[in-house]
């Protein structure tokens, strides 16, 4: 079958090969499209409601005055010339619609280095088939799930027109000491080949470098974090920053379901409470900051406790709180 692409709303003429140029003609068009159940047969005589959708012209060609999504499918013509020789034409018709130029909405004017930021949402309206949206940084394609890049996509279809609206939300974590004015753009690539991509106007947010924070200190009492069963451990999170940030607590890397507090009192310690504890300070202007982790363990009477309960490094990395 010969592949034909036609723009939605435009006319389409399909030639019936081998058909005499004018009547009388022995030919038959068969259609299997979104408008038909199985095959529909059209003859030169025509007439009826189908004339508004597709009709056979005097030269045997099939004429569709305004192609729609439902006209996608197979079109076949079987014609016999004056000598009785049979010729078959076979077309696969696919339709398309180029959307309006994509746009970036809800774009950020400023990004913070070292933490995830929403850059903006790219929107393309009125495409068929759906096509795809992709993001570019300084002209180079951005690959989702690489180097702090994440993309959330959504595709919606208009209930009446059948055309697609695409949305793509870009989140990035700019590197510290990187480009202070990166250029982001988004492009729409049509689902059908041979149509060029459409690109948005670029956006150039500023990248703000937060001043490195003083380290979050975690103090454990009793020192070393070893306690007898049923004893109490007090963890204090000391943050030099003003105003005081919200302090949450982690155990074995998982958030503890507790109200925010700079002091964590662990009374009546039991075996289930052993593990590594850390605190996370969340500032309104900075990303979250984690303390070192301390190990809490139970010592049976007569045992000597460890001298230091610290594990891991500086704990200055950023992390997402559940």
């Amino acid at each position: 079958a010969q592949n034909i692409t036609a723009r939605i709303g435009e006319p389409l003429v399909l030639k019936c090969k081998g058909a005499p140029k004018k009547p009388p003609q022995r030919l038959e068009w068969k259609l299997n499209t979104g408008r038909t159940e199985a095959w529909k047969v059209l003859s030169p005589q025509g007439g009826g409601p189908w004339d508004s959708v597709a009709r056979v012209l005097p030269n045997g060609s099939l004429f569709l005055p305004a192609v729609g999504i439902q006209d996608e499918g197979i079109f076949r013509c079987q014609a016999m010339n004056r000598n009785g020789k049979e010729t078959k034409s076979n077309y696969r018709v696919r339709v398309y619609q180029i959307p309006g130029k994509p746009e970036i909405v809800d774009s950020a004017s400023e990004l913070t280095a070292g933490v995830p930021n929403k850059v903006g949402t790219c929107v393309s309206e009125g495409s068929y088939p759906a096509g795809t949206l992709s993001w570019h940084l300084d002209g180079k394609p951005l690959v989702p799930n690489e180097k702090g890049v994440s993309v959330k996509e959504q595709t919606r279809r208009h209930p009446e027109t059948g055309l697609f609206t695409l949305q793509s939300e870009l989140m990035v974590t700019p590197a510290r000491g990187g480009d202070p004015r990166p250029t982001f753009s988004c492009s729409f690539s049509p689902g059908l080949p041979r149509h060029r991509a459409l690109r948005t106007a670029p956006i150039q947010p500023r990248v703000w470098e937060p001043v490195p924070l003083e380290e979050v200190q975690l103090v454990v009492e009793p020192e070393g974090g070893a306690v007898a069963p049923g004893g109490t451990v007090t963890l204090t999170c000391e943050v030099p920053a003003q105003p005081s940030p919200q302090i949450h607590w982690m155990k074995d890397g998982v958030p503890l379901p507790l109200p925010p507090s700079p002091v964590l009192i662990l009374p009546e310690i039991g075996p289930q409470d052993q593990g590594t504890y850390s605190c996370v300070a969340t500032h309104s202007s900075h990303g979250p900051q984690e303390s070192r982790a301390v190990s809490i363990s139970i010592i049976e009477p007569g045992e000597e406790g460890p001298t230091a309960g610290s594990v891991g490094g500086s704990g200055l990395g950023t992390l997402a709180l559940a």
Epitope: L258, P260, I265, E268, G270
Partner: antibody, heavy 120, light 107 residues
Amino acid sequence: QVQLQQSGAELVRPGTSVKVSCKASGYAFNNYLIEWIKQRPGQGLEWIGVINPGSGGTNHNEKFKVKATLTADKSSSTAYIQLSSLTSDDSAVYFCARSAGTARARFAYWGQGTLVTVSA
Amino acid sequence: DIQMTQSPSSLSASLGERVSLTCRASQDIGSSLNWLQQEPDGTIKRLIYATSSLDSGVPKRFSGSRSGSDYSLTISSLESEDFVDYYCLQYASFPFTFGSGTKLEIK
């Protein structure tokens, strides 16, 4: 011994608010958390939220974020829940419970409950 | 939110019988589960904490266990004061959630 003594039953009008208290004794009030739980007549239990009396920090069940305000007075070792814009759906028994960040202390002791009836 | 599906909702049993109540967690809660007992007058008492640890003063006939996402409270030999309501409670993550309860009735 640990005790959580709750205030008496309340009969209140729709649209008004009510404050239920939970007085703690027999332990260091600042070292533990107070959880609040709702039980409608003949129904199950629903967690409302928790307060750390030492820091004043709270966490709420999203469902009760607007409805319930949790506070604590360290000087009297008393925790409070204030319920606002009352409707018949708020008619229930409200419990306080003592908790902490350790397994052994989670919801270990319970108050006797306070019945709040909202009626015109 | 984590759903706690408790079964059965009611259970008729005889004195001396062994019974088990179950709660199924919709997400991983580790061992962060309590079993609570509620008397007809509304008094609530914790029986089991951290899935299987018995509270002090609670009779040894009560025990807690876990198999995957299913948590069980077993009473080895029912006594007359055991015919009350029981609830499970998960405290692994906010918001904490309870099972819908089991009413234990005397046959």
